[in-house]
Interface confidence: medium
């Protein structure tokens, strides 16, 4: 349906509050360096304009596209050239090239300091003084740090954030109430950001087909009672939603997401028995609830997969008539029967099935050729199962910090050219898979672990793409989305790496280390570990263990000393000399 004014249409559909929030998020994701006040002003102006267009659709400029309106507004920012350099050149382009240019300048690693919360009384005073501004600042700070954050979901988290403050600012001990709640929300937000970045990468690097296949597998697992046409319908709509959000079209994305939630709730009977509770909620909570809804029970009467995909005499005919649909039904049927498999594994199986049919349907006797295709899946299934088992055993033995260090060593040896901060960040996140997944029952472990690893490895790929330094990382990142994790797992030590020159400055520590929160202390130690490995890539696990043990003791000793700084400057060089000797 064509509207006279697109901006009025979205304003009317979304309502003023959500509209303003989404505009603020959009601007913050594009112009990540601008101060909050500038974005508030821009968002206010756009919202006022939209309001005017909603009242009079034939008003001046109301018929312009959203990209034109938003782009024109962004290009009025006076400091564009100073703050963003060549991004200012985008403003000389016409739509749609201008928007593509803005998108290309989104920075996945803007390097802002981590958000540090002021003390609770000050926070509560700010919240109570101007709730709207307070929540706007939250949207802005998250959006500029995560330029691909799923905007409608960010509105939901802002609502949760508001709920936390509404509750905790009334509490006797505000800090005790806020601390754990804000931390739990922070964890969810970081995971949400990484998941959406993975979806955007799937769409941008591997296209709609890859994203749709991923979604068919995921939704078939979650809604095994729905038929293939129903799954396809939801996947088609979901693909549109994520394409819009990943492309910066946040108003359309949020509007279409609400429409999809409405559709799912109106058609619960043909989708899942688990949607009822979600469907009674307001729009933001409803969409979030549907996205997280538990798996429906499997229908009891599922026939064997072999009947349709191996034993049927028409397999090659059905495949050749419409390859994508036939493979789609295979993926759907396999996924709904295997909720315990990771999506990545299911996609690998579908790929293997496709390769077998391509090969067999060209032979004189296809049925004999593909007769054992389902048995040939075994090694593909065993590989992630064994990987999860081995790594969970290691995690249980070492704990999260020790497991992170083991991964840090593993990944630094695989790709020593990658920057130290990236190796530390990615290995720390990879290590969290243990905490997140290893305590789950056997039937949920693989799905949890491998799909989480895919999301974390995507972060490595995104950061590496910005400054490519390792051909093998580029290869693993770009060859196949579903084989990224096996590709990284399969990398051995990079024998071509020339060790880094020793730099004493890298191993010089100061008393400020003692006052850092535990997580930041760990990062400092892990940074030293990576630098050590880059200097001595042939170091054995035993040697590293000894050196890291000595390092821990040194930090503990100096932090307990009366003259901390003196201790660091005196003992530090001794430690470095001992470490160098130990690693010869």
């Amino acid at each position: 349906e064509a509207y006279k004014s697109e901006i009025a249409h979205r304003y009317n559909d979304l309502g003023e509050e959500h509209f303003r929030g989404l505009v603020l998020v959009a601007f913050s994701q594009y112009l990540q360096q601008c101060p909050f006040e500038d974005h508030v002003k821009l968002a206010k102006e756009v919202t006022e304009f939209a309001k005017a267009c909603a009242a009079e659709e034939s008003g001046a400029n109301c018929d312009k596209s959203l990209h034109t309106l938003f782009g024109d507004k962004l290009c009025t920012v006076a400091s564009l050239r100073d703050k963003y350099g060549d991004m200012a050149d985008c403003c000389e382009k016409q739509e749609p090239d201008r928007n593509e240019c803005f998108l290309a300048h989104k920075d996945d690693n803007p390097g802002f300091p981590p958000l540090v919360a002021p003390e609770p009384d000050a926070l509560c005073a700010a919240f109570q003084d101007n709730e709207q501004l307070f929540l706007g600042k939250y949207l802005y700070e998250i959006a500029r740090r995560h330029p691909y954050f799923y905007a409608p979901e960010l509105l939901y988290y802002a609502q949760q954030y508001k709920g936390v403050f509404a509750e905790c600012c009334q509490a006797a001990d505000k800090a005790a109430c806020l601390g754990p709640k804000i931390e739990a929300l922070r964890e969810k937000v970081l995971l949400s950001s990484a998941k959406e970045r993975f979806k955007c990468a799937s769409l941008q690097k591997f296209g709609d087909r890859a994203f749709k296949a991923w979604s068919v597998a995921r939704l078939s697992q979650r809604f095994p009672k729905a038929d293939f046409a129903e799954i396809s319908k939801v996947v088609t709509d979901l693909t549109k939603v994520h394409k819009e959000c990943c492309h910066g079209d946040l108003l359309e994305c949020a509007d279409d997401r609400a429409d999809l939630a409405k559709y799912m709730c109106e058609n619960q009977d043909s989708i899942s028995t688990k949607l009822k509770e979600c469907c009674d909620k307001p729009v933001l909570e409803k969409s979030q609830c549907l996205a997280e809804v538990e798996r429906d029970e499997l229908p009891g009467d599922l026939p064997s997969l072999a009947a349709d995909f191996v034993e049927d005499k028409e397999v090659c005919k059905n495949y050749q008539e419409a390859k994508d649909v036939f493979l789609g039904t295979f993926l759907y049927e396999y996924a709904r029967r295997h909720p315990e498999y990771s999506v990545s594994l299911l996609l690998r199986l579908a790929k293997e099935y496709e390769a077998t049919l391509e090969k067999c349907c060209a032979t004189d006797d296809p049925p004999t050729c593909y007769a054992k295709v389902l048995d040939e899946f075994k090694p593909l299934v065993d590989e992630p199962q064994n990987l999860v088992k081995t790594n969970c055993e290691l995690f249980e033995k070492l704990g999260e910090y020790g497991f992170q260090n083991a991964l840090l060593v593993r990944y630094t040896k695989k790709a020593p050219q990658v920057s130290t901060p990236t190796l530390v960040e990615v290995s720390r996140k990879l290590g969290k898979v243990g905490t997140k997944c290893c305590k789950k029952p056997e039937s949920e472990r693989m799905s949890c672990a491998e799909d989480f690893l895919s999301v974390v490895l995507n972060r490595l790929c995104v950061l590496h793409e910005k400054t490519p330094v390792s051909e093998r990382v580029t290869k693993c990142c770009s060859e196949s989305l579903v084989n990224r994790r096996p590709c990284f797992s399969g990398l051995e030590v990079d024998e071509t790496y020339v060790p880094k020159e020793f730099n004493a400055e890298t191993f010089t520590f100061h008393a400020d280390l003692c006052t850092l929160p535990e997580a930041e202390k760990q990062v400092k130690k892990q940074t030293a570990l990576v630098e050590l490995l880059k200097h001595k890539p042939k170091a054995t696990d035993e040697q590293l263990k000894t050196v890291m043990g000595d390092f821990g003791a040194f930090v503990e000793k100096c932090c307990a000393a009366e003259n901390k700084e003196g201790c660091f400057s005196e003992e530090g060089p001794k430690l470095v000399a001992a470490a160098q000797a130990a690693l010869v």
Epitope: A229, K233, N267, S270, F326, E333
Partner: nanobody
């Protein structure tokens, strides 16, 4: 009882067009995905196109992609197939069918309508 009644077939020259219709009754049409299948003389059944209950998405066999368009009018309980740029190999009996609960097969189909493409 499920009933599907196809119409609109006939003789047409190569490059010509036809529009097939299928009137449905005996089940809730607006909650059922539907498809067109065809059977050429002496050949097996071949599926042509699928449409979701809401009208999107739609799927087509590779052999008809870009030439055929499936659509539906839920208020009239009717399924359509617009066939353009017809070729001799499109000659077949066309059946409309109700999409099943699971596999890419079909539960019920009508008596069919014959489409002959010949000069």
């Amino acid at each position: 009882e499920v009933q599907l009644l196809e119409s609109g077939g006939g003789l047409v020259q190569p490059g010509g067009s036809l529009r097939l219709s299928c009137a449905a009754s005996g089940f809730t049409f607006d909650t059922s995905s539907m498809l067109w299948v065809r059977q050429a003389p002496g050949k097996g059944l071949e599926w042509v196109s699928v449409i979701h209950q809401s009208g999107t998405p739609t799927y087509y066999a590779d052999s008809v992609k870009g030439r055929f368009t499936i659509s539906r009018d839920n208020s009239k309980n009717t399924l359509y197939l617009q066939m353009n740029s017809l070729r001799a190999e499109d000659t077949a009996v066309y059946y409309c069918a109700k999409f099943p609960s699971s596999r890419m097969k079909f539960d019920y189909w009508g008596q069919g309508t014959l489409v002959t493409v010949s000069s």
